[in-house]
């Protein structure tokens, strides 16, 4: 067949599977006179032969692992053996078959992991090699944990990255591993070629012994620190320790205090930097953080609690410069005159704030001294010896010593002797009639004025009138303010009126004095008055049961899922139709009868969470009044965004020729939610064929270093593919390309001759 199996002498490439016995010729070269014979040279390995007539064939099975490409030359000779055509290159590419099993580099691995280590953070790598072509499934390896010993409650504490062989803790392992219970584990790990996907794959196993070490990154016990310390500051109060040396410690003040009196040194020792004042702040809660050299948190922060212990550094204080009490002329012995309540800023219910009261002076001492006594601990003043007479002494002044265990303070009390309260308040009207108000009358409105009079001594507690509503207003919608000069009562609206619950209220007022009535005198019907409040209906808008409705769903819920519901009631009992407003992303629909809200499109947390829309409740029929509330849909993250490069990395270059291997740093990110510790990406080269020229090494959870393995690069652009895995559930992998140019440099910048100015790299490495 001319062309496919035979033809003239020209450069050609043939692909042949390894391991196959020769079954047909490779090619029949045709001689053009004066050529009469052919000659084969190059990497024949005594396998490839050309007969004089130009028949190229091989005489035994090829082995890709010995040589993946045979570079041959064929020349045509004349009758005298002189080359008249060629030699031309003939390339034989040996195609891979799966004829090599993967083998672990070690039959046993040993490693250690600290309890509570971050899930998904590798602490050990197992590594296997397979001589087959890594660009084909034959050389693509798949790692698996075969068994974990011991296995507690059927829970896996360890996981392996099936592509990289990185062993890390599962979430359960991070939470439950405890060296006190089980200090060591054994894993049997298998590796398969064919990406683990074929029944015909080869495999190998290895054993991994893991020691669990104690995590010393633990919150210390709460600290007690005495206030107003006179010791030299700073004073060490506690400490934290990261598991390994070299951590950088810092404190985080979550309360954002104007004065944060704590510090931490690079050993992890925590200090109070100045004296504390319990009366300013009695407790502090802050966080200790450990970071790596790149400023990335190594673990979760620890909560530090500091309680400030009280000392007696505050004297008692009087409630006011002078405290005034009244006592009636005829009051009996032992009657309470009033209570002096002093204060102490020291800690409540301790000896530092426990107060004693003592009368140290009475003026005037008429008709005698010691007319009053004060209860030592309660501060209640009582009449001690006899009834008082206003015409003899209308006013007494007492000096009272108030003391805690260390301090004494003098407080002053004025006691006014007043006329006996033998007259009751009398209403000028016993019935104030009917009053009709709309239910939407403003709060604070004065709706009625009432008046009673009292014949006792003016401007004393015996004649002052207090009005109380004693009947007809159990909801406390009304109140009465009294003018102290005229004793006029102003009835005001304190809470909204409501036709639906109280259309008619029969209100009863009582007028009373703050001072007790003398023995034998009682309040009677003259001290009571009534009125009738009639509330008229106003059509009110529906009322939502909440100002804001909140629901929480995973961002990957199926379309049509119920994501929440809202409820409203109409005060007049009309039915309600619900609607949505402001669904700018077109994600939701509402059942207008029930208020149930459903998804109608894929949700996306990364587009913004919570997603806020308005819900409207409208009366059906009637005047169609409506109310608005908020519906907030909190979207919980799922790992649905693969990692990507954090910025544009076009323009990376190395000066050619390289004098030494070079490297560059790049950063990855993704749009999913990352908790306090940030993302934890793993990095690897995107294809096996890059491994001869490049290597990638992780710096931290977001940064990696791409390094050259040698200096023999051509002067051109290389596109390096990098795999970035986010270790999420499920793990997502992004393959990104870093374009790196090797170019001649002038003064550290890429030099291009005129006319080759497009795409000049701008970043030198």
């Amino acid at each position: 067949q001319e062309g496919k199996f035979s033809g003239p002498l020209k450069p050609m490439t043939f692909s042949i599977y390894e391991g196959q016995e020769p079954s047909q010729i490779i090619f029949q070269f045709k001689a053009n006179p004066p050529a009469v014979t052919f000659e084969l040279t190059g990497e024949t390995d005594n396998i490839f032969v050309i007969e004089r007539e130009g028949l190229l064939y091989y005489n035994r099975a090829l082995d890709r692992e010995t040589r993946s490409t045979h570079n041959l030359q064929v020349a045509a000779l004349d009758a005298n053996g002189i080359i008249v055509e060629g030699p031309v290159p003939i390339t034989i590419k040996v195609k891979d078959i799966n004829d090599n099993r993967p083998t672990f580099l070690q039959s046993k691995y040993e490693g250690s992991v600290r309890q509570n280590s971050r899930p998904g953070k590798p602490f050990l790598y197992v590594n296997a090699t397979d001589l087959d072509d890594p660009a084909t499934p034959n050389g693509q390896l798949y790692y698996q944990i075969v068994i974990q010993l011991p296995m507690i409650n059927n829970v896996m504490y360890f996981q392996i990255n099936n592509k990289t062989g990185a062993i890390s803790l599962t979430r359960e392992g991070s939470q439950e591993l405890n060296p006190a219970k089980n200090p060591s584990y054994n894993l049997v790990i298998s590796v398969k070629d064919m990406g683990g996907q074929s029944e015909n794959s080869f495999s190998d196993t290895t054993s991994v012994d893991i020691i669990v070490t104690e995590n010393i990154w633990k919150a210390p016990k709460p600290v007690e620190m005495v206030e107003n310390s006179t010791d030299p500051h700073p004073i060490k109060i506690t400490q934290v320790r990261w598991n390994d040396p070299g951590a950088q410690y810092s404190l985080v003040d979550k309360e954002k205090l104007p004065r944060f009196p704590f510090s931490i040194d690079q050993e992890g020792d925590i200090y109070v930097t100045q004296p504390l004042d319990r009366e300013e702040k009695d407790a502090y809660v802050f966080y200790a953080v450990a970071k790596d050299e790149y400023g990335k948190p190594l673990s979760y922060p620890l909560e530090i609690h500091v309680k400030v212990k009280d000392i007696n550094d505050n004297p008692p204080t009087c409630p006011s410069p002078v405290t005034v009490f009244e006592v009636q002329e005829n009051e009996r012995l032992g009657n309470s005159i009033g209570t002096l309540t002093a204060h102490d800023r020291d800690e409540e219910n301790t000896a530092n704030s426990f107060l004693n009261y003592r009368i140290v002076e009475q003026t005037p001492k008429l008709p005698m001294d010691g007319l009053f006594l004060i209860q030592t601990y309660a501060g209640m003043l009582q009449l001690a010896k006899q009834s008082l007479k206003k015409q003899d002494t209308p006013q007494y002044n007492l000096t009272i010593e108030v003391s805690d265990k260390d301090f004494k303070t003098l407080c002053f009390v004025q006691i006014n002797v007043i006329d006996i309260n033998d007259q009751i308040p009398i209403f000028e009207k016993s019935d104030y009639g009917n009053l009709t108000l709309a239910e939407d009358t403003n709060i604070g409105s004065t709706i009625l004025t009432i008046q009673a009079t009292d014949a006792d001594e003016p401007f004393t507690g015996s004649s002052k009138i207090l009005y109380h509503i004693i009947k007809g207003d159990s909801e406390g919608r009304l109140g009465v303010d009294t003018d102290p000069h005229t004793n006029t009562g102003y009835v005001i609206i304190k809470k909204p009126l409501d036709f639906e619950t109280a259309a008619v209220s029969n209100i009863v007022f009582k007028a009373e004095n703050p001072e007790p009535l003398v023995f034998g005198v009682k309040y009677n019907a003259s001290s009571f008055a009534k009125f009738t409040l009639i509330v008229t209906d106003v059509n009110e808008a529906p009322q939502f049961s909440q100002h804001v409705f909140q629901a929480k769903v995973s961002e990957d819920v199926a379309i049509g899922t119920k994501v929440g519901n809202v409820t409203a009631k109409d005060p007049e009992g009309l039915d309600i139709s619900y609607s949505l407003r402001g669904d700018t992303r077109g994600w939701l629909k509402i059942d207008h009868v029930t208020g149930e809200i459903f998804s109608v499109a894929p949700l996306d947390r990364e587009a913004g969470s919570p997603y806020r829309v308005q819900v409207v409740a409208t009366e059906v029929g009637g005047s169609s009044l409506s109310s608005v509330s908020e519906f907030h849909l909190i979207l919980m993250d799922v790992n649905d965004n693969p990692p990507r490069l954090a910025k544009d990395y076009t323009g990376l270059f190395f000066c050619h020729p390289l004098s030494a291997p070079g490297s560059l740093i790049f950063e990855a990110t993704d749009d999913d939610q990352h908790l306090f510790r940030g993302p934890h990406f793993t990095f690897s080269l995107g294809s096996g064929s890059l491994q001869n020229d490049w290597e990638v090494s992780k710096i931290n959870g977001t940064h990696a270093r791409l390094s050259t393995r040698h200096t023999e690069f051509e002067e051109r652009e290389y596109v390096v593919l990098i795999r970035i895995n986010d270790g999420g559930r499920p793990p997502l992998e992004g393959i990104v390309s870093l374009p790196v140019t090797f170019c001649s440099c002038v003064e550290g910048s890429c030099f291009r001759p005129a006319g080759h100015q497009t795409g000049i790299p701008t970043v030198g490495m």
Partner: nanobody, 121 residues
């Protein structure tokens, strides 16, 4: 698509009763709400009653509450309106409607051709 066909209209004396029916076909599995609307000569179309197709909860306009009852038979894909104590002001063309999404009462996407109800005094 959802197709709707009403039946049961007619002439009735004030105080009498009528039962309207509405047969739904097509994508009935997508229905969220169904409702009865009416339009009297020279007036705007108004909602009479609506039902949550799956939950069966109902709402009524104030003027028919206590006199009309909306119901549905999911197995027959049929909506009903039982009208009692009819008044002359109930005279109108009654439409059956369905909605499968959207934000409010105005999002009824599918409509029947209407059936005339006349109440004489």
């Amino acid at each position: 698509e959802v197709q709707l066909v009403e039946s049961g209209g007619g002439l009735v004396q004030a105080g009498g009763s009528l039962r309207l029916a509405c047969a739904a076909s097509g994508r009935t599995d997508s229905i969220l709400n169904m409702g009865w609307f009416r339009q009297a000569p020279g007036k705007e179309r108004e909602i009479v009653a609506a039902i949550s197709w799956f939950r069966g909860e109902t709402i009524y306009t104030a003027s028919v509450k206590g006199r009309f009852t909306i119901s549905r038979d999911k197995s027959k894909n049929t909506l009903y309106l039982q009208m009692s104590s009819l008044k002359p002001e109930d005279t109108a063309v009654y439409y059956c409607a369905a909605r499968n999404g959207g934000y409010d009462l105005n999002d009824y996407a599918y409509w029947g051709q209407g059936t005339q109800v006349t109440v004489s005094s």
